[in-house]
């Protein structure tokens, strides 16, 4: 029959060439002379001339060694024709399978592989995967089957076998406990890939395993005891810098310190922060310390990390003895702002109040007093006793110096320390009203017609406070009542002035006496301009000129 079984040819054959492989034979050769030919890639198309056929015998020839890794299978067609060139058979499929030889070593995909694993992990933890390829056949033979192994490990601490490798997948895993970044931060493994499933050619590469940091070291105070001196009353004052050492990776959350005042700060006087670069604990005062109340504080500070510990670790504690230094403190007026009620207009030399200060210092320091600010110059202060007396007339109605009935004075106390310190106090004198102002009308100039005059309404004001104000009473004096009338309205806060007799055009003085509810009387002269006119007028018209 015109058929041929698949032909297997080993790659890398040594010849001699041409090498006879198989004979093509048509049973039509009994009837006529047959000529054989082959076509296809490897025969008459690229790669041309690898195979040929003896035209008359039908022997299939191999002309050169084959390379399976280049072409693993050739598909050719055999042809049989008679002398006249007529085809005597259908084209026959010829399959030539190139069988593998182990002519390639494994190759790692990288010269150096890099992986990482957390320190302190359990055996069995995967680290990384390495890969090697082999061009040889791994399906029908072991030529391309790669087996991985670890040849060596550096350093060999704490065990010479810290890692193992899956022989088929190349996955590197931890096999021994004891990975400690602080002792060995990196391992270098020489890895091997061997074909023939471990029995053939070997190639090597390097796997570098970085050991990642875990928070397995507690920060430790160094030193653990501190003594510091702080002046009393200082706020935000740096008391002490506390130093810690931590074996974990610098500037990582496992290294960065977190400080906590565990005891000794009952009054919440202190605070502690972490310096971002040095990792030191900066102890500062949150509030001023008081030497007189407590001259020594013993603080207990604990340090941990930003990251939690991965295992149970003892925490380090520091003891800080803070000595509070005495400072000459300023005297403090008690109260800092003192309100005193005093009648306005009290006689000169009359006592107003005693305003004294206390010195926080325990020494019996002498305090002297003086007035610092007395805008109207109404007061004096005894330097020894703090007695404040009137030396001017206290006037509640003085709008320049008195606001809302209050006259504000600043006083100063000075101790005899070295150097001396001063403290100030505010004396707020609430001036009690006295009926020392009579009522006054507004306006004090009026213009009125001498015929059918309009009544003039004047507002009455009194600088005093109730009850030394309305209702007011009005009275005309000095014969002003011959031509004029003055009446207070029902509310008692305005006076109505009326012209009751004819007066020729001129300017007149109207003598008006107003008294308040406390009978304080005030005489006011109203300048009245009388005009020759009827009814309402604002200014007198000029003299009438006839034509």
């Amino acid at each position: 029959d015109w058929v041929v079984a698949p032909i297997s040819v080993p790659e890398n054959g040594k010849g001699p060439f041409p090498q006879r492989l198989n004979q093509l034979k048509s049973n039509k050769d009994r009837d006529t002379k047959i000529f054989y030919s082959i076509t296809g890639p490897g025969a008459d198309s690229p790669p041309e001339g690898v195979f040929a056929v003896e035209k008359e015998t039908g022997w299939l020839l191999l002309n050169k060694p084959l390379d399976r890794e280049e072409i693993a299978k050739y598909e050719l067609f055999g042809h049989a024709v008679s002398e006249n060139g007529a085809s005597v058979e259908d084209p026959m499929n010829i399959s030539i399978i190139v069988t593998d030889q182990n002519d390639h070593k494994p190759k790692f995909t990288q010269d150096t592989f890099r992986g990482s694993v957390l320190e302190g992990v359990l055996p069995g933890t995967s680290v990384m995967q390495v890969t090697a390829t082999d061009e040889d056949d791994a399906i029908y033979t072991y030529n391309g089957v790669v087996a991985y192994s670890i040849h060596s490990q550096e350093p060999k601490d704490p065990h010479d076998l810290m890692f193992t490798i899956h022989r088929s997948t190349g996955t590197i895993s931890v096999i021994s406990s004891g990975l400690d970044r602080e002792k060995v931060p990196e391992y270098t493994l020489t890895i091997q890939a061997t074909d023939m499933d471990g029995d053939g050619s070997t190639t090597t590469a390097v796997a570098v395993v970085e050991i990642l940091d875990a928070n397995d070291n507690a920060p430790m105070f160094d030193p653990q005891k501190y003594e510091a001196h702080v002046p009393e009353n200082a706020v935000g004052h740096e008391v002490q810098r506390l130093t810690v050492t931590d074996l974990d990776a610098p500037n990582s959350p496992a290294w960065r310190a977190t400080y906590l005042i565990m005891g000794g700060d009952d009054g919440d006087h202190f605070t502690i922060t972490t310096h971002p670069e040095s990792n030191q604990g900066i102890l500062t005062t949150r509030k001023g310390l008081d030497f007189e109340a407590k001259n020594q504080h013993t603080l207990y500070v604990e340090v941990t990390n930003e990251a939690p510990f991965v295992l149970k670790l003892p925490t380090s504690t520091a003891t800080i003895v803070v000595h509070v230094e005495d400072v000459n403190e300023a005297p403090v007026f008690v109260p800092p702002s003192k309100v005193v009620e005093v009648q306005e207009g009290i006689p000169t030399g009359e006592p107003v109040c005693v305003y004294t200060a206390e010195d926080p210092d325990k020494e019996n320091q002498k305090i002297s007093y003086r007035i610092l600010r007395d805008p109207a110059g109404w007061l004096a202060m005894d330097p020894d006793s703090g007695q404040v007396t009137a030396v001017g007339t206290l006037d509640r109605e003085d709008e320049q110096f008195v606001r809302n009935n209050i006259y504000e004075v600043m006083v100063l106390a000075m101790d005899n320390g070295s150097p001396p310190t001063t403290g100030t106090g505010t004396l707020l004198l609430t001036l009690i009203d006295v009926n020392d102002h009579g009522p006054v009308p507004e306006p004090r100039q009026i213009t009125i017609c001498n015929q059918s005059p309009v009544r003039q309404v004047l507002n009455i004001t009194d600088k005093d406070l109730s009850p030394h104000t309305s209702p007011f009473q009005a009275q005309l004096t000095d014969d002003s009542d011959i031509y004029w009338t003055a009446e207070v309205n029902e509310e008692g806060d305005t006076v109505v002035l009326s012209l009751k007799k004819f007066l020729k055009q001129d300017t007149y003085d109207v003598h008006l006496s107003l008294s308040d509810h406390g009978n304080k009387e005030q005489l006011t002269v109203i300048r009245a301009t009388v005009c020759d006119c009827h009814g309402h007028v604002e200014t007198c018209p000029g003299p009438w000129k006839g034509g």
Epitope: L122, G124, S168, S177, G178
Partner: antibody
Framework: EVQLLESGGGLVQPGGSLRLSCAAS????????MSWVRQAPGKGLEWVSA????????YYADSVKGRFTISRDNSKNTLYLQMNSLRAEDTAVYYC??????????WGQGTMVTVSS | QSALTQPASVSGSPGQSITISCTGT?????????VSWYQQHPGKAPKLMIS???KRPSGVSNRFSGSKSGNTASLTISGLQAEDEADYYC???????????FGGGTKLTVL
């Protein structure tokens, strides 16, 4: 000579607690992972729990997860197994074993835990 | 169900050789050369007989030997003696947790 000595076993009622200890000597304790393996009467070996040399990593079998706690004190060369909410199926001999050179060796002599009402 | 498969029992006469098999997968026995064999006498703790497939710890008789082919490991005891009668367990390293898998155990009877 490397030695492991377990203690703390005994009879306990279901729901009760026990704490097993394993005292180690003859090797650098903190450099090795340690394990607890148990063997129920007439049965095979079952891995219960393991802990890394530093104590930072632990493993528990699903059958004991949430009930047992493994710990170690490297300053005392001692391994512990705190067993809470004990059940009848936890009845077994409990062995501690050192993991090194790719194997469990040596094993302690074992301590018997019986959970019964 | 154990991860590694062992025959439940084997037996042999004194002086004979016996082999106990331990079959795993390509991710344990087949992947790593960390197969161990333990001997356990009744009421006693397991004792390591073979580590790393074929290494004998000091003090273990050279009658005990180990080997591995593919996913199956074997323990061979030659010149069987009465004191060899015990339970034998195999174990293998595997990546992941737990990192050790055990066989179900084989009871060796010396006839």
């Amino acid at each position: 000579e490397v030695q492991l000595l377990e203690s703390g076993g005994g009879l306990v009622q279901p729901g009760g607690s026990l704490r097993l200890s394993c005292a180690a000597s003859g090797f650098t304790f903190s450099s090795y992972a340690m394990s607890w393996v148990r063997q129920a009467p007439g049965k095979g070996l079952e891995w219960v729990s393991a802990i890394s040399g530093s104590g930072g990593s632990t493993y528990y079998a699903d059958s004991v997860k949430g009930r047992f706690t493994i710990s170690r004190d490297n300053s005392k060369n001692t391994l512990y197994l705190q067993m809470n909410s004990l059940r009848a199926e936890d009845t077994a001999v409990y062995y501690c074993a050192k993991w090194g050179d790719g194997t469990l060796n040596p094993w302690g002599q074992g301590t018997m835990v019986t959970v019964s009402s | 169900q154990s991860a590694l498969t062992q025959p439940a029992s084997v037996s042999g006469s004194p002086g004979q050789s016996i082999t106990i098999s331990c079959t795993g997968t390509s991710n344990d026995v087949g992947a790593y050369n960390y197969v161990s064999w333990y001997q356990q006498h009744p009421g006693k703790a397991p004792k390591l007989m073979i580590s790393e497939v074929n290494k004998r710890p000091s003090g273990v008789s050279n009658r005990f030997s180990g080997s591995k082919s593919g996913n199956t490991a074997s323990l061979t005891i030659s010149g069987l003696q009465a004191e060899d009668e015990a339970d034998y367990y195999c174990s293998s390293f595997t990546s992941g947790l737990p990192w050790v898998v055990f066989g179900g155990g084989t009871k060796l009877t010396v006839l």
